[in-house]
């Protein structure tokens, strides 16, 4: 099943201590999906969309950008035939970068 769309939600982090907000959205015919956020291949957070919605926002507390490294991806799962869970392809990556300190 098709990959979700992913984006950073403002306010964007300006340091590693700032929280990170990431939205993931499934295609229109997959409301109420279960979403998983990954960073560097490891699960960071799981959220379920409301039954009438096709997306979620992951709110990661400050400091969560330190480890593991690498870009964020998200994926969603839906119940298919015979109540078996089907997983989507992974989203495109989203990289979180911080402004270079000027001191």
């Amino acid at each position: 099943i098709p990959a979700p769309s992913i984006r950073l939600v403002p306010p964007y982090p300006s340091s590693q201590e700032d929280p990170i907000h990431i939205a993931c959205m499934a295609p229109g015919n997959f409301p109420g999906a279960n979403f998983t956020l990954y960073r560097g291949g490891q699960v960071v957070q799981l959220l379920q969309a409301p039954t009438d919605q096709r997306g979620v926002t992951f709110n990661l507390s400050g400091g969560s950008s330190k480890a593991p490294g690498g870009p964020f991806h998200c994926q969603y799962g839906v119940l298919g035939e015979l109540n078996q869970s089907q997983l989507s392809d992974l989203s495109e990556p989203v990289n979180v970068s911080f402004p270079v300190p000027t001191w």
């Epitope: 992913i6 984006r7 403002p10 306010p11 939205a23 959205m25």
Partner: antibody, heavy 119, light 107 residues
Framework: QVQLVQSGAEVKKPGSSVKVSCKAS????????ISWVRQAPGQGLEWMGG????????YYAQKFQGRVTITADESTSTAYMELSSLRSEDTAVYYC????????????WGQGTLVTVSS | DIQMTQSPSSLSASVGDRVTITCRAS??????LNWYQQKPGKAPKLLIY???SLQSGVPSRFSGSGSGTDFTLTISSLQPEDFATYYC?????????FGQGTKVEIK
């Protein structure tokens, strides 16, 4: 039913500042973004910036950086937009609006505040 | 900044016509696109979010499609109350830029 009620029309001199308020009533304030969009007479829509009251950090379009300040007071469910160093090109209707955090889609708009900059 | 270009800038149509408005982004915005309708002297109204989801309370004659850089808003059968200006908006990254608008007028 959530409503956003904005302060009244303003007439300002070039070089001065204006502060527009936006009070939310009848619904949740803090778990959405409040954005500000302006529309000059006969022109299109221009996004200025926004704030998520729950997070407290404002963000701005580069065009307005340094000239606009967006704040929010969760205790009164009120957001504010202050624009300084006004010029005639800032004459516009200023809208506050409530954005869904997933889609950044604006489902609820204030009634608009006309700011006229004239000497 | 991501530029959004709508076409046409204006069109004339009759009640019952099928109307299509296109919006092109200067770079890939995936499905992060919203459509609004605005009538003179009024605040805009959300029609479509996430490129294709119909906002609650919006008539089903409105539909949105597209992904990447090219998007379409379709009104399947134009009604008298649909004569207005329509805007697309990208929300992939700030600033959340709008298209210049498409004015739908009565033929």
């Amino acid at each position: 039913q959530v409503q956003l009620v904005q302060s009244g029309a303003e007439v300002k001199k070039p070089g001065s500042s204006v502060k527009v308020s936006c009070k939310a009533s009848g619904g949740t304030f803090s778990s959405y973004a409040i954005s500000w969009v302006r529309q000059a007479p006969g022109q299109g829509l221009e996004w200025m910036g926004g704030i998520v009251p729950k997070f407290g950090t404002a963000y701005y379009a580069q065009k307005f950086q340094g000239r606009v300040t967006i704040t929010a007071d969760e205790s009164t469910s009120t957001a504010y937009m202050e624009l300084s160093s006004l010029r005639s090109e800032d004459t516009a209707v200023y809208y506050c609006a409530r954005e869904n955090l997933v889609y950044s889609a604006i489902a609820i708009w204030g009634q608009g505040t006309l700011v006229t900059v004239s000497s | 900044d991501i530029q959004m270009t709508q076409s046409p800038s204006s069109l004339s149509a009759s009640v019952g016509d099928r109307v299509t408005i296109t919006c092109r982004a200067s770079q890939d915005i995936s499905n992060w696109l919203n459509w609004y309708q605005q009538k003179p002297g009024k605040a805009p109204k959300l029609l479509i979010y996430g490129a294709s989801s119909l906002q609650s309370g919006v008539p089903s004659r409105f539909s949105g499609s597209g992904s990447g850089t090219d998007f379409t808003l379709t009104i399947s059968s134009l009604q008298p109350e649909d004569f207005a200006t329509y805007y697309c908006q990208q929300v992939t990254s700030t600033p959340f830029t709008f298209g210049q608008g498409t004015k739908v007028e009565i033929k």
